[in-house]
């Protein structure tokens, strides 16, 4: 399982006070950003449990590992789910807490309830604050069952649940009718996909025994361990205050784990630290107990002492969970709870074990899991010891599970589980990734997806020219970086392969598929320079240049020219494609700019150097507006324009261009040329009575200038439906006469 | 699809007996509280009685206390209205109805099409 | 025990806004659940918990409730709404079921 721990701190007198901790024990765990580990997520679920909106929770990382919440600031705001995902890939697990309000008018008996498939789950909720009606219970949010307030048993309000099927597991709930649902009873059920004591898919494995309250994982048989446990049957005490799967962990604070709920990826849920209990974890165990929760009872045997935090402390000279086994018994000695190796390799491993009579070397055997058994190939014999090393056949997957170290003397037997996990050489699924190339040197992504097991720990990067049968050149890389391939040929293809490999004898994985990377051209290295340039428009530009003349042939495709417009912060480039051009025509350029212009060789996609920059002024575009348009309606079909000519002109005026358009009209605008610009007055005909026009113009010189203003102005009369504007102009004497 | 059928209406003289079934599918039948809803001809709506889903706890409307008895089968999906010493003013169609919780209040989201009693001499 | 007391009738235009209230002592303290009947028809709910709506029912119909009025409003009235309607509540006091005398709502 997922070493995962969510901490909920439970001394309630201050909301503000109260926080939650996720604490992951995995390798690399939250690091985020790269591929190998993503991130610690902690969050609160209100999918099921809304609680009214306050201020944002404060989330903080404390390094890679460890991530906290914090900023509640009612009561109610701790109401509810909250959640901590952690682990990567498949091993990716959602830890989830359940907190009530202890003001509630309902509280759970016992808020996480582990059950096994086709069990009868119990739910019990305890009144607090009597109300007489209905209590309604809910699962995951929806309506599940009625109770009328006469059904309380002792005090309880009680839900049975016959038959449980894993899609029974989630939130449950126990509300009175008409009651804020902060006040509920929240419970959490969490149903085993397999019946008591298997595992696996058909549910047809055994589970291992875990011991201390430990719980068989459905998927793996692994022991979920209770906090303060470890071992592969969660055999072994942590020392006071500590946890996760290797007992890493601290508790916070002066007084250890009091007043902290744990909470452990499924099946397990969440319980108080080893040795303390109660709804809020702040009491001690009684004597004679210990544990999670306080949950198991210690009944030493021959003068043992309990401690609530490890159960029997034995005197000299005697061993076991109750103290019941003399020292005479041969005991196998620090035993490994799991061991790692890789596929096909041939490990050797050891077991020590002590004893009278002493353990030679044929009463130590080592056993399989498909119940081969294995004798040592050699002992080292200590005062206070015997160690048996074990040569182990090739492994194959099917070695992976618990193996079982025994020994056995006249004085009697011990053995100890360990499991042993059996992983597989990570071979890349995919081809490195080209990120870059220049002609001498390929920069490499070898970050790919890869099947077998990770970590991964180094990375190496084959390569070799293509077609060729020389040695592969090999570079070992950081997991997480990009790698630079550097002294290669210009414009030459390698075939680019990936082997990775995980910790370990024999980690190294096949190597994966190849690809083809080809290096870039040679660098054009002529520089330039700008011959001349002149404008032939307010909107293009000639620009002619030279190159150096060197012997041998060019080494280039074309050109770049690069024209940049400093006031918008713009940059054009033209493509001219013929490395034997030498002029080019720019069009569509912006009147009245300031442009600095270079041009560079280019060959394939590598730019030579730019020749020294050239600045460029642009005639400013068309004049002026157009002054004092006026539009006069003349009869039901026609509106005469009256304007004075624009002031300060850059040259003659060519023409006028009116432009009509219907008020409110959603069609395109019309453009009238007024094609004698000494004009100051035109009439539009053909327009439709009773119609309100919208009216403006401009002059051209070189190009269109300014709009002028917009005027408004509506047709007479009702006349006939016209065929569409016309213009005719006059003098504007004359216009005004008529 | 939920569905409530009711049956067992008819006409019947004042001081005698009948006993309505209403069948229900498509939800958990056994864990929901029901209840009778009955409706005199051009008159409104009345509430008759309620059952738990449990079936152990029954509610009944004053008007029909202590002649009236709310059951439920939960093997059969069937709920059921023994009424005694029938009287005219019983005259009514009889709808079954399912008690729902939105939040934590109650109302009936799904009701029968209803049987016609009738109490005549 | 609990009463709740409704106009017996409300005219409304096609195309306008229907009130029908619902009176109560203290009824802004209750949950108020509104159904419509259509003749011959079973009692369909319109409204549930003062002003939820369930999946199905057009938006036109909303509720509300405080003091001693519970309210269902539709908007923009069409021929189909022309029914009758009776709110609801739960008497926790008493543990029963109480209705309204029913509106007759016609569209004009």
């Known amino acids: 399982a997922v070493d995962l721990t969510l901490l909920a701190n439970l001394r309630l007198t201050d909301p503000q006070r109260f926080f939650l901790t996720c604490v992951s024990g995995e390798a690399g765990a939250g690091r985020g950003s790269d591929a190998w580990g993503p991130p610690l997520l902690l969050e609160k679920d209100d999918r099921i449990v809304r609680t009214p909106p306050g201020p944002p929770l404060r989330l903080a990382r404390n390094g890679s590992h460890q991530v906290t919440l914090r900023g509640f600031s009612k009561p109610s705001d701790l109401v509810g789910v909250f959640s901590c995902v952690g682990g990567a890939g498949a091993r990716r697990t959602r830890v989830i807490y359940v907190h009530n309000s202890p003001g509630a008018h309902l509280l759970p008996d016992k808020v996480t309830h582990t059950v096994n498939k086709g069990d009868t789950a119990v739910l019990s909720a305890r009144v607090h604050k009597e109300k007489q009606t209905d209590v309604i219970w809910k699962s995951n949010g929806s309506y599940f069952y009625t109770l009328d307030w006469h059904e309380a048993q002792d005090g309880r309000f009680l839900l049975q649940l016959p038959n449980v099927q894993p899609p029974s597991s989630g939130i449950y709930s126990a509300t009175y009718l008409e009651a804020s649902p902060l006040g509920s009873a929240f419970f959490r059920l969490i149903v085993r996909g397999c019946g008591a004591g298997r595992w696996g898919p058909g549910c047809t494995k055994e589970c291992p025994g875990c011991l201390h309250g430990g719980v068989c994982h459905d998927h793996d048989g692994e022991c979920v361990c209770p906090p303060g446990f470890t071992g592969t049957r969660c055999e072994q005490a942590c020392r006071e205050g500590r946890f996760g799967q290797s007992c890493q962990e601290q508790c916070p604070g002066i007084s250890g784990c009091r007043g902290l709920t744990f909470c452990l990826p499924d099946p397990y849920g969440c319980s108080c630290g080893s040795g303390w209990r109660g709804s809020q974890c702040q009491e001690a165990c009684a004597p004679g107990h210990f544990g999670a929760d306080c949950r198991l009872q210690c009944q030493c045997q021959n003068g043992g002492t309990c401690d609530r935090f490890s159960g029997c402390v034995c005197p000299s000279g005697w061993h076991g969970v109750h103290c019941e086994k003399s020292d005479r018994i041969p005991q196998i000695l620090n035993m490994a709870s799991e061991l790692e190796f890789n596929l096909e390799t041939m490990p050797r491993i050891n077991c020590a074990a002590a004893g009278n009579p002493f353990p030679v070397r044929g009463s130590i055997e080592l056993r399989k899991p498909d119940g081969t058994v294995l004798l040592s190939t050699k002992a080292i014999v200590e005062p206070e010891k015997t160690t048996a090393e074990f040569e182990v056949p090739r492994l194959v997957l099917a070695d992976s599970g618990f193996w079982e170290c025994r020994v056995s003397t006249s004085g009697g037997q011990d053995s100890r589980r360990f499991k042993v996990n059996v992983k597989v050489p990570p071979v890349p699924l995919a081809a490195p990734r080209l990120l870059t190339k220049q002609s001498r040197q390929l920069v490499v992504s070898p970050l790919v997806s890869f099947s077998g097991d990770g970590p991964i720990s180094t990375v190496r990067l084959h390569y070799r020219p293509q077609d060729s049968t020389m040695d592969w050149s090999t570079i070992v890389v950081d997991p997480s970086e990009n790698v630079t391939l550097m002294n290669l040929r210009p414009k030459t293809g390698y075939s680019v392969r990936v082997q990775l490999s995980r910790p370990g004898e024999g980690g190294e994985g096949a190597w994966g598929p190849p690809t083809l990377m080809t290096t870039d051209c040679p660098e054009p290295l002529l520089q330039p320079w700008l011959e001349g340039w002149h404008v032939e428009g307010t909107d293009r530009l000639r620009v002619s240049w030279s190159l150096p003349l060197v012997p041998g042939p060019l080494v280039g495709d074309g050109f770049l020219l690069r024209l940049w417009d400093g006031t918008r912060g713009q940059e054009r480039r033209e493509n001219v494609s013929s490395p034997q051009a030498r002029t080019a025509l720019l069009t569509g350029l912006t009147p009245g700019t300031h442009y600095q212009l270079d041009v560079q060789l280019y060959h394939c996609t590598l730019l030579g150097p730019a020749s020294p920059p050239a600045h460029v002024l642009l005639p400013p575009s068309g004049p002026p507006a157009p002054r004092h348009l006026h539009a006069q309606a003349l009869s039901d079909s026609e509106i005469q324009l009256t304007w004075k000519h624009p002031e300060a002109l850059p040259g003659p005026i060519s023409k006028y261009v009116v432009e009509v358009q219907v008020a409110g009209g959603a069609g395109d605008p019309l453009w009238i040329d007024v094609d004698r610009p000494e004009e100051t007055s035109t009439i539009i005909r053909g327009l439709n009575a009773s119609t309100r026009y919208l009216f403006r113009m401009r002059a051209s010189i070189q190009g269109l200038g300014d709009w002028s203003n917009t005027v408004e102005e509506s047709t007479l009369g009702n006349g006939l439906q016209a065929e569409g504007p016309v213009q005719e102009s006059r003098a504007a004497e004359e216009g005004l006469d008529q | 699809e939920v569905q409530l059928l009711e049956s067992g209406g008819g006409l019947v003289q004042p001081g005698g007996s009948l006993r309505l079934s209403c069948a229900a599918s498509?939800?958990?039948?056994?864990?929901?509280?029901m209840g009778w809803v009955r409706q005199a001809p051009g008159k409104g709506l009345e509430w008759v009685s309620s059952?738990?889903?449990?079936?152990?706890?029954?509610r009944y409307a004053d008007s029909v206390k202590g002649r009236f008895t709310i059951s439920r089968d939960n093997s059969k999906n069937t709920l059921y209205l023994q009424m005694n010493s029938l009287r005219a003013e019983d005259t009514a169609v009889y709808y079954c109805?399912?008690?729902?919780?939105?939040?934590?209040?109650?109302?009936?989201?799904?009701w029968g099409q209803g049987t016609l009693v009738t109490v005549s001499s | 025990q609990y009463e709740l007391t409704q106009p017996p009738s409300v005219s409304v235009a096609p195309g306008q806004t229907a009130r029908i209230t619902c009176g109560g002592n203290?009824?802004?303290?209750?949950?108020v659940n509104w159904y419509q009947q259509k003749p011959g028809q079973a009692p369909v709910l319109v409204v549930y918990?003062?002003?939820g709506r369930p999946s199905g029912i057009p938006q036109r119909f909303s509720g509300s409730n405080s003091g001693n009025t519970a309210t269902l409003t539709i908007n923009r009235v069409e021929a189909g709404d022309e029914a009758d309607y009776y709110c609801?509540?739960?008497?926790?006091?008493?543990?029963?079921?109480?209705f309204g005398g029913g509106t007759k709502l016609t569209v004009l």
């Open positions: 609801q509540v739960w008497d926790s006091g008493s543990d029963h079921w109480v």
């Open positions: 109805a399912r008690n729902f919780v939105e939040s934590s209040h109650y109302y009936h989201d799904y």
């Open positions: 918990d003062d002003s």
């Open positions: 203290n009824i802004g303290i209750k949950s």
């Open positions: 498509g939800f958990t039948f056994s864990h929901y509280k």
């Open positions: 059952i738990y889903p449990s079936g152990g706890f029954t």
